[in-house]
């Protein structure tokens, strides 16, 4: 219980806002407001899940209004820490008493905010078809009378090509809008930056997304192809696997060929590139083939298209269901 000769502080934590798309920025600021106390020595400590945090992460300032004082302390957190669901506490020691307030990331609410994504061209489109495109994808839009505008531009200020637009209503009632822009192969390879600007009456501000050729080290993919052995009960089907690894950057296209003809993408299943922690990226690709196919010609080719592969940006490996026959 506080004695009557001082007024205890009120402690309140405020949190920095999300960006226009409803996403958390790379860093989050927590502001601890300690207000309305009789001037005197005050000690502010930040806790993470009950543990004292590094004081270097926070800054504090005090002001006096009439007979009462206020102090504020700001804590900067990385997005990773904030999203990890830890609890952050501002603990105030004053006149031998402790006052505190705690906060943590709120549970995701429905519906989520609008998100925009901008893809890079696939290596297949860039190096084989030589007609690269980039796609601006806007998801989680609430269907409304307002029009979503997607505007393309280039950092160089040069004009952009004509884009194609598609709108799709999703099962959950939200709207997805995509705009696909053809880009020049040389422009892309030489490092041009493309921007997609998304505006909508219900968005507090425009969403801007940009994309350009990935910088950083280059490494060509290694390709290994395998056939699984015959499995009881499935004599007329066989699974082929392709491991593609140690490539950088992560952009890669994977194709399977039979009889010198590229098989439709729907025929195979390929993982997203994963990091190896030091050797580059890897993907696995899986293709199911039928007896009719391998009896016609028992050679299947797994091909990777990647900018660091030479010659002609492709590496491929052949695999047979029954090698040696």
């Amino acid at each position: 219980v506080c004695s009557r000769d001082f007024t205890p502080p009120t402690v309140k934590i405020l949190q920095s806002s999300c960006d226009g798309g409803g996403h958390f920025p790379p860093t989050i600021q927590l502001l601890c407001l300690v207000s309305g106390y009789t001037p005197g020595t005050i000690n502010i400590t930040w806790l993470e899940d009950g543990q004292v945090m590094d004081v270097d992460l926070s800054t504090a300032s005090t002001t006096q209004e009439g007979e009462l004082a206020s102090t504020q302390s700001e804590l900067t957190l990385s997005q990773k820490h904030w999203l990890s669901d830890r609890t952050y506490t501002c603990q105030v020691t004053y006149q031998g008493h402790t006052f505190e307030d705690s906060t943590k990331k709120c549970a995701d609410s429905n519906p989520r905010g609008v998100s925009a994504y901008l893809s890079r061209p696939s290596p297949f489109d860039l190096f084989i078809r030589k007609s690269p495109t980039i796609t601006c994808l806007v998801v989680d839009l609430a269907p409304s009378k307002g029009t979503v505008n997607l505007t393309w531009s280039r950092a160089s200020g040069k004009p952009v090509n004509h884009s194609t637009r598609k709108e799709e209503k999703q099962r959950n009632g939200t709207l997805t809008v995509t705009s696909t822009l053809p880009v020049g192969t040389r422009d892309w390879i030489e490092g041009e930056t493309y921007q997609c600007r998304v505006t909508h009456p219900h968005l507090p501000r425009a969403l801007m997304r940009s994309t350009t050729k990935t910088s950083g080290p280059r490494a060509a993919p290694e390709v290994y192809a395998f056939a699984t052995p015959e499995w009881p009960g499935s004599r007329d089907k066989r699974t082929l696997a392709c491991l593609i690894q140690n490539f950088m950057p992560e952009d890669i296209s994977v194709q399977w060929l039979h009889n010198e003809v590229q098989l439709p993408d729907a025929r195979h299943s390929t993982t997203q590139p994963r990091k190896t922690k030091g050797s580059g990226f890897f993907v696995f690709s899986r293709l199911e083939v039928t007896r009719a196919e391998w009896e016609q010609k028992d050679e299947f080719i797994c091909r990777a298209v990647h900018e660091a592969a030479s010659p002609s940006q492709t590496v491929q490996r052949a695999v047979s269901v029954n090698p040696g026959k």
Partner: nanobody, 122 residues
């Protein structure tokens, strides 16, 4: 948007020194571990060094230990690599890099700068 811009590369004689800088913008630099990586012509890329957010924890590849020093100035949003006793085998493109998850050792980083070329030759 994360942006990294390296500078300080150039031609230096064996045994000489260079200091690379990396100016960061578009993110809270002081909240991210940072790294330097390099790639010699025709060779695989190599992680060189990493430093934690506060600059207290540093790691080095065996090939540069005792010769290179990584440091950072969070007030200036800048990462440095002091390279002493340079050898011809240090000739490479050097990039500063960071990652949303892990940048304190070898990795395929989320973000790289445009690179700066270091040539060690007499």
């Amino acid at each position: 948007e994360v942006q990294l811009l390296e500078s300080g590369g150039g031609l230096v004689q064996p045994g000489g020194s260079l200091r690379l800088s990396c100016a960061a913008s578009g993110f809270r630099f002081g909240n991210y571990d940072m790294a330097w990586v390099r790639q010699a012509p025709g060779k695989r890329y190599e992680w060189v060094s990493s430093i934690d957010t506060g600059g207290d924890i540093t790691h080095y590849a065996d090939s540069v230990k005792g010769r290179f020093t990584i440091s950072r100035d969070n007030a200036k949003n800048t990462l440095y690599l002091q390279m002493n006793s340079l050898r011809p085998e240090d000739t490479a493109e050097y990039w500063c890099a960071t990652d949303e998850e892990y940048a304190l050792g070898p990795n395929e980083f989320d973000y790289y700068g445009q690179g700066t070329l270091v040539t060690v030759s007499s």
